[in-house]
Amino acid sequence: VPLSRTVRCTCISISNQPVNPRSLEKLEIIPASQFCPRVEIIATMKKKGEKRCLNPESKAIKNLLKAVSKERSKRSP
């Protein structure tokens, strides 16, 4: 891990940019914990495997989460 620190958060900056669900490889939601006192959302993009920290408070990101969970519920039997 590049940063040695007592608080083990992942995100250095957060993005409010809308993300096309089709360009997503993976979406991780890391709940607040004793290691990092804030929710972190990390999107792994299909393009070059770029990982991007998303702003959990952003309207665009909340819409993305809804779209992804809707897509998942469609897929599950």
């Epitope: 891990v1 590049p2 940063l3 040695s4 620190r5 608080v7 958060c9 992942t10 995100c11 250095i12 900056s13 957060i14 993005s15 409010n16 940019q17 990092c36 006192p37 804030r38 990390i42 070059k48 495997g49 770029e50 990982k51 991007r52 920290c53 998303l54 702003n55």
Partner: antibody, heavy 124, light 109 residues
Framework: QVQLVESGGGVVQPGRSLRLSCTAS????????MHWVRQAPGKGLEWVAV????????GYADSVKGRFTISRDNSKNTLYLQMNSLRAEDTAVYYC?????????????????WGQGTTVTVSS | EIVLTQSPGTLSLSPGERATLSCRAS???????LAWYQQKPGQAPRLLIY???SRATGIPDRFSGSGSGTDFTLTISRLEPEDFAVYYC??????????FGPGTKVDIK
């Protein structure tokens, strides 16, 4: 427009302290990690310190660890560098720079916005 | 601690020529952590490339980055007069956390 403006530089004697400020405008400061980078006269770039968007992540170059402290006040859109026990080798132009949107410990988007710098001279 | 070496120290070329700048790391660096910057005299640096090969916003497509492991390259396909400057590579992820190379100066032949 997106802008970073440094202030607080000047001439200071070895062993003394100085606090640099960097005021941000034109973007949501509280969403971005911030850095201090310095450049000694006629030399290359040297990274000094980083602070995460919420102030939880901090990191320092070995050359300043224990002497310099990076901090931020998101309500004032301002980044700080408290420099103690200054040495002649700390003489440089000090730039503040913004970490790219979405950067994490897994993927680095570079320092995408820079201020014009403030000059610190440590001399007796 | 990862050390970055840039070569050549100075590159003397004419406008219209191709410039190839090298950045070598003392240990393997993830391409996710490699960036390139341009700096002109009296100015702040400007981000050109991140993730070893992705162009930053507003950077012309004559600038391209490539490489992996320990060897990375910045290529300027056709030098424009405004491209004569110092170029720095930078890596993120070791202690010290962010490291710049010593720079390559591209000057007019």
């Amino acid at each position: 427009q997106v802008q970073l403006v440094e202030s607080g530089g000047g001439v200071v004697q070895p062993g003394r302290s100085l606090r640099l400020s960097c005021t941000a405008s034109g973007f949501t400061f509280s969403d971005y990690g911030m850095h201090w980078v310095r450049q000694a006269p006629g030399k290359g770039l040297e990274w000094v310190a980083v602070i995460g968007y919420g102030g939880l992540i901090k990191g320092y170059a070995d050359s300043v660890k224990g002497r310099f402290t990076i901090s931020r006040d998101n309500s004032k859109n301002t980044l700080y560098l408290q420099m103690n026990s200054l040495r002649a080798e700390d003489t440089a132009v000090y730039y503040c720079a913004r970490e790219g949107a979405g950067s994490s410990i897994y993927y680095y988007y570079g320092m995408d916005v820079w201020g014009q710098g403030t000059t610190v001279t440590v001399s007796s | 601690e990862i050390v970055l070496t840039q070569s050549p120290g100075t590159l003397s070329l004419s406008p219209g020529e191709r410039a190839t700048l090298s950045c070598r790391a003392s240990q393997s660096v993830s391409s996710s952590y490699l960036a390139w910057y341009q700096q002109k005299p009296g100015q702040a640096p400007r981000l050109l490339i991140y993730g070893a090969s992705s162009r930053a916003t507003g950077i012309p497509d004559r600038f391209s980055g490539s490489g992996s492991g320990t060897d990375f390259t910045l290529t300027i396909s056709r030098l424009e007069p405004e491209d004569f400057a110092v170029y720095y590579c930078q890596q993120y992820g070791s202690s010290p956390i962010f490291t710049f190379g010593p720079g390559t100066k591209v000057d007019i032949k």
